[in-house]
């Protein structure tokens, strides 16, 4: 089996308040099966931003069509960015189970929010 890698190509992204932020994430293998989740921050205080298994997440849309059976692109777009959205975002693969368990994480993308242009 090819070892699954999670690629977050952007170390940082800067977005003006009120605009949308696109956070890129691709995986290199469909296995092991299990959902992709996005979090802001790390550790126990991290905040769930998107979970492939459940929804909806009103401000979050996937950039590609994740219902394709061979889809490996789990990039997301977050709309109407505010300063509260600043932080490091991690794309994480979970392995199926009861409960699902964290399998591998991307390196993270730091989102910074610029003041809305006047």
């Amino acid at each position: 089996e090819e070892e699954l890698q999670i690629i977050q190509p952007d170390k940082s992204v800067s977005v003006a308040a009120g605009e949308s932020a696109i956070l890129h994430c691709t995986i290199t293998s469909l296995f092991p099966v299990g959902p992709i989740q996005w979090f802001r921050g790390a550790g126990p205080a991290r905040v769930l931003i998107y979970n492939q298994r459940q929804g909806p997440f009103p401000r979050v849309t996937t950039v590609s069509e994740t219902t394709k059976r061979e889809n490996m692109d789990f990039s997301i777009s977050i709309s109407n960015i505010t300063p509260a959205d600043a932080g490091t975002y991690y794309c994480i693969k979970f392995r199926k189970g009861s409960p699902d368990t964290e399998f591998k994480s991307g390196a993270g993308t730091e989102l910074s929010v610029r003041a809305k242009p006047s």
Epitope: F31, Q52, R53, T67, R69, K96
Partner: antibody, heavy 118, light 107 residues
Framework: DVQLVESGGGVVRPGESLRLSCAAS????????MSWVRQAPGKGLEWLAG????????YYIDSVKGRFTISRDNPKNSLYLQMSSLTAEDTAVYYC???????????WGLGTLVTVSS | ALTQPASVSANPGETVKITCSGG??????YAWYQQKSPGSAPVTVI????KRPSDIPSRFSGSASGSAATLIITGVRVEDEAVYYC???????????FGAGTTLTVL
């Protein structure tokens, strides 16, 4: 409530064609992958074909590839199965089903009966 | 191919377990579909190995480990009489498969 209603079944002769429809309501149709499953008399369930939410990607079981075509019209909330070169072995109840995030099925239609007989 | 027993019987109130084997835990998710009569609409009682739809009674549960999945009905009722199909999605082939079905008889 999620509702799936199939139509278009009937009696056809071997070699003829038929187009089945599935009208969806009670959910955002354009967000879900869909599938067709059939059940021959006295037999079990057999998955035939699936289609991604946007309709760009389709998947088939080998035995119907080239004869059956799955498609969808998202503005009309409708799923279709075009069947050609029908044989007696295609006699079955045909169900449309909504897919879960991981391509299992959570809701099923009531089915439409297709009988292929000379 | 997914393999499940042809039939299972139980008395009301007993716990029923129906097993399904043949998938690969690494690449397969399982579901269980209930069909009360031939040609009637199937009802999903479990999907994603162990997830129960909100309208399904809590006596239905599921699990998966290794190459097998199990449907458990705790405190089976007469109205649970049906054929139960194990279904799987294999991420290697992009194909859905079904077992041949297990007829549950409640005595």
């Amino acid at each position: 409530d999620v509702q799936l209603v199939e139509s278009g079944g009937g009696v056809v002769r071997p070699g003829e064609s038929l187009r089945l429809s599935c009208a969806a309501s009670g959910f955002t149709f354009s967000s879900y992958a869909m599938s067709w499953v059939r059940q021959a008399p006295g037999k079990g369930l057999e998955w035939l074909a699936g289609i991604s939410a946007g309709g760009s990607d389709t998947y088939y079981i080998d035995s119907v590839k080239g004869r059956f075509t799955i498609s969808r019209d998202n503005p009309k909330n409708s799923l279709y199965l075009q069947m050609s070169s029908l044989t007696a072995e295609d006699t079955a109840v045909y169900y449309c089903a909504r897919e879960t995030w991981n391509h299992l099925f959570d809701y099923w239609g009531l089915g439409t009966l297709v009988t292929v007989s000379s | 191919a997914l393999t499940q027993p042809a039939s299972v019987s139980a008395n009301p109130g007993e716990t029923v377990k129906i097993t399904c084997s043949g998938g690969d835990y690494y690449s397969t998710y399982y579901a269980w579909y209930q069909q009360k009569s031939p040609g009637s609409a199937p009802v999903t009682v479990i999907h994603s190995d162990d997830k129960r739809p909100s309208d399904i009674p809590s006596r239905f549960s599921g699990s998966a480990s290794g190459s097998a999945a199990t449907l458990i009905i705790t405190g089976v009722r007469v109205e649970d009489e049906a054929v139960y199909y194990c279904g799987g999605y294999d991420g290697r082939t992009y194909i859905n498969t079904f077992g041949a079905g297990t007829t549950l008889t409640v005595l």
